[in-house]
Interface confidence: low
C-alpha cells in the first residue's frame, strides 16, 4: 500500500547500557479513528462523531505494523522478521536495545472498509542511539521500586538529570494509557498501592532549527514491601512421623514460605540424619509454587524410589534459610500396619 | 547529575556515637536505596549497611547491634550512626547509591554513584 | 557472610600489558558480582556488574566473566590511569561483601 499519505512521527530511544531495557511504540492513527482500534481514547455513544471513516472491529489487535527497510524493499510484516519485537494489542514491543532497532515502523488498521481507510497509517521513524557520557550519566533507572504503603515517585529517566524548573512538559502513559494529569518529569505517588506496578512511558519533545521529535524512555515500576524481618517457615511437611510402606516408592515435599527479600537468596535442601552422620542428598530443583508481593512459596521434594528397613531408622531433614536465619523440619518415616 | 556528599564531624572519642550525614543533590532520594560503607586506612571496603527512601534497613550483621541508618526525604538526606565506637572505627565512610538492574532475568543492586568520603578518626 | 578472595593480592605491570585479577567466593554466588576501580584519596568507581556487563562510559579494554565461585577482571591493554586498586563485590546474598583488594601498580 502507498505510505506516502501515512502521518509521521519522529522518536528518540537512548539507551542505557547498564539495563535490560525496553522500548514501545505506540499506533497512534489519527482521531477519532483510533478509538475503534485500540481503545486508548474510547467515545462514548454521545461523542460519536458525525462521519467515522473507520469503521474496523473493536478487536484490540486490529492493526497491523511494518518495518520499511532502508534499501527500499517492499514493506516487512513485524511478526514474520523480528522475534524481538512483540506486538501486544496496539502497542510494539522491543526487549532489547540497540542501534539496530533504528528505521521506520508504520501501522495500519487491518481492516480497510471504505476508501478513507486507505490513507489512515501512522510512520514511526526510529532513532536509537546508546547514551553517551555526555548525556546524563547517572540518570533514572529503567527499573523503579516503590514502596508499598508509603510515598514514592516514578522519575523519567531521559529527563532526571534536570531540575523540575527546567523540564519540558511530559506526557506519561502507563500500561499504553495516556496519565492525561501527568506532565512534569517525576510522577509523585501520594501512597503506593500494587496498581502503581506496571510499564510507564514518558515522553517529551525536543525540536532544532530543522525539524521536532519526541525522546521516549520506558520504566518498569514493582511495588515490594519492606525486607521481611522472619526466617522462612516450612508449611509441609507438618508432622514429624510418616507412615509408608517398604519397597514402595516414596516422596516426601518440603514447602516452605519466604518473606520478600530485596535481595532474594532461598536456599531450600534436604539431609538425612542417620546415627551420627549427616548428609545433604541431591534431590530434584525447587520451585516456586506461588510468588506474591509479600511473599514466594518454594518446594523441593526427597525421591525415594523405595523405602527400605534401613529408611526407618535415619531422620529426613528439610533446611530452608533466607538472610534472617534457618528453619528445619524433620519427618521420621514409619511401617505401615 | 546525581551527586552525594558526607558530612560530619572528622574527630570521636572512644565510647561516643559517630554521626553522619550524606545530602542528596542533582536528583531525588526517592525510589532508591542508599548505603554506607567504609574503609580503614590501607585496607579493604566494609559495607555497613543500606535504607530504602520509605526506612526500610538492612545493616551487616557484624555491625547491627551499633548502626542505625535512618532517611530525611524532605531534606534529601540520609545518616549514620554509630555507637560506642572504637579505634577500630577509623576509617573513611562512604555514602552511595544502590541502583536495581536487570541481570539475566534476576534484579541486583550495585552501588553506582559514591560519595567522595569523609575521614573519622576516632581518638581521645 | 561469603567471602571474596582477590588474586593477586598486588601486581606490576606496564602500559599496554594484558592483566587478568581474579575473585573467588567461598560459595556459589550466581552472575551477582561487581568490580570497582579505586584511585588512592577517591571513592570507588563501578566497572562491571552482572560479573561481565560494562557500565556506561568504562573503556571497552575492561571486561569480566564467570559465574557461580570464580570471576574474572581483564585489561587487555593498561593504560596509565588504570593503575589502581580494584575490588570486587558480591550483592547476591546478606552482608554484601568485597574482596580484599588488588593493587595495580607500574612495573
Known amino acids: 500500500f502507498n505510505i506516502s499519505g501515512c502521518s509521521t512521527k519522529k522518536l528518540l530511544w537512548t539507551y542505557s547500557t547498564r539495563s535490560e531495557e525496553e522500548f514501545v511504540l505506540f499506533c497512534d492513527l489519527p482521531e477519532p479513528q483510533k478509538s475503534h482500534f485500540c481503545h486508548r481514547n474510547r467515545l462514548s455513544p454521545k461523542q460519536v462523531p458525525e462521519h467515522l471513516p473507520f469503521m474496523g472491529s473493536n478487536d484490540l489487535s486490529d492493526v497491523q505494523w511494518y518495518q520499511q527497510p532502508s534499501n527500499g524493499d517492499p514493506l516487512e510484516d513485524i511478526r514474520k522478521s523480528y522475534p524481538h519485537i512483540i506486538q501486544d494489542k496496539c502497542t510494539l514491543h522491543f526487549l532489547t536495545p540497540g542501534v539496530n532497532n533504528s528505521g521506520s515502523y508504520i501501522c495500519r488498521p487491518k481492516m480497510i472498509k471504505s476508501p478513507y481507510d486507505v490513507a489512515c497509517c501512522v510512520k514511526m521513524i526510529l532513532e536509537v542511539k546508546p547514551q553517551t557520557n555526555a548525556s546524563c550519566e547517572y540518570s533514572a533507572s529503567h527499573k523503579q521500586d516503590l514502596l508499598l504503603g508509603s510515598t514514592g515517585s516514578i522519575s523519567c529517566p531521559s529527563l532526571s538529570c534536570q531540575s523540575d524548573a527546567q523540564s519540558p512538559a511530559v506526557t506519561w502513559y502507563k500500561n499504553g494509557k495516556l496519565l492525561s494529569v501527568e506532565r512534569s518529569n517525576r510522577i509523585v505517588v501520594d501512597e503506593v498501592y500494587d496498581y502503581h506496578q506496571g510499564t510507564y512511558v514518558c515522553d517529551y519533545t525536543q525540536s532544532d532549527t530543522v525539524s521536532s521529535w519526541t525522546v521516549r524512555a520506558v520504566v518498569q515500576v514493582r511495588t515490594i514491601v519492606g525486607d521481611t524481618k522472619l526466617k522462612p517457615d516450612i508449611l509441609d511437611p507438618v508432622e514429624d512421623t510418616l507412615e509408608v510402606e517398604l519397597g514402595k516408592p516414596l516422596t516426601i515435599s518440603c514447602k516452605a514460605r519466604f518473606g520478600f527479600e530485596r535481595v532474594f537468596n532461598p536456599v531450600i535442601k534436604w539431609y538425612i540424619k542417620d546415627s551420627d552422620l549427616e548428609w545433604e542428598v541431591s534431590v530434584p530443583e525447587a520451585k516456586s509454587i506461588k510468588s506474591t508481593l509479600k511473599d514466594e512459596i518454594i518446594e523441593r521434594n526427597i525421591i525415594l524410589e523405595k523405602v527400605t528397613q534401613r529408611d526407618l531408622r535415619r531422620k529426613f531433614v528439610c533446611f530452608v534459610q533466607n538472610s534472617i536465619g534457618n528453619t528445619t523440619q524433620s519427618v521420621q518415616l514409619k511401617e505401615k500396619r | 547529575q546525581v551527586q552525594l556528599q558526607e558530612s560530619g564531624p572528622g574527630l570521636v572519642k572512644p565510647s561516643e556515637t559517630l554521626s553522619l550525614t550524606c545530602t542528596v543533590s542533582g536528583g531525588s532520594i526517592n525510589n532508591y536505596y542508599w548505603s554506607w560503607i567504609r574503609q580503614p586506612p590501607g585496607k579493604g571496603l566494609e559495607w555497613i549497611g543500606y535504607i530504602f527512601y520509605s526506612g526500610t534497613t538492612n545493616y551487616n550483621p557484624s555491625l547491627k547491634s551499633r548502626v542505625t541508618i535512618s532517611v530525611d526525604t524532605s531534606k534529601n538526606q540520609f545518616s549514620l550512626k554509630l555507637s560506642s565506637v572504637t579505634a577500630a572505627d577509623t576509617a573513611v565512610y562512604y555514602c552511595?547509591?544502590?541502583?536495581?538492574?536487570?541481570?539475566?532475568?534476576?534484579?541486583?543492586?550495585?552501588?553506582?554513584?559514591w560519595g567522595q568520603g569523609t575521614t573519622v578518626t576516632v581518638s581521645s | 557472610a561469603i567471602q571474596l578472595t582477590q588474586s593477586p593480592s598486588s601486581l606490576s605491570a606496564s602500559v599496554g600489558d594484558r592483566v587478568t585479577i581474579t575473585c573467588r567466593a567461598s560459595q556459589g554466588i550466581s552472575s551477582a558480582l561487581a568490580w570497582y576501580q579505586q584511585k588512592p584519596g577517591k571513592a570507588p568507581k563501578l566497572l562491571i556488574y552482572d560479573a561481565s556487563s560494562l557500565e556506561s562510559g568504562v573503556p571497552s579494554r575492561f571486561s569480566g566473566s564467570g559465574s557461580g565461585t570464580d570471576f574474572t577482571l581483564t585489561i587487555s591493554s593498561l593504560q596509565p590511569e588504570d593503575f589502581a586498586t580494584y575490588y570486587c563485590q558480591q550483592f547476591n546474598s546478606y552482608p554484601i561483601t568485597f574482596g580484599q583488594g588488588t593493587r595495580l601498580e607500574i612495573k
Open positions: 552511595a547509591r544502590d541502583v536495581g538492574i536487570a541481570a539475566r532475568n534476576s534484579y541486583y543492586y550495585v552501588m553506582d554513584v
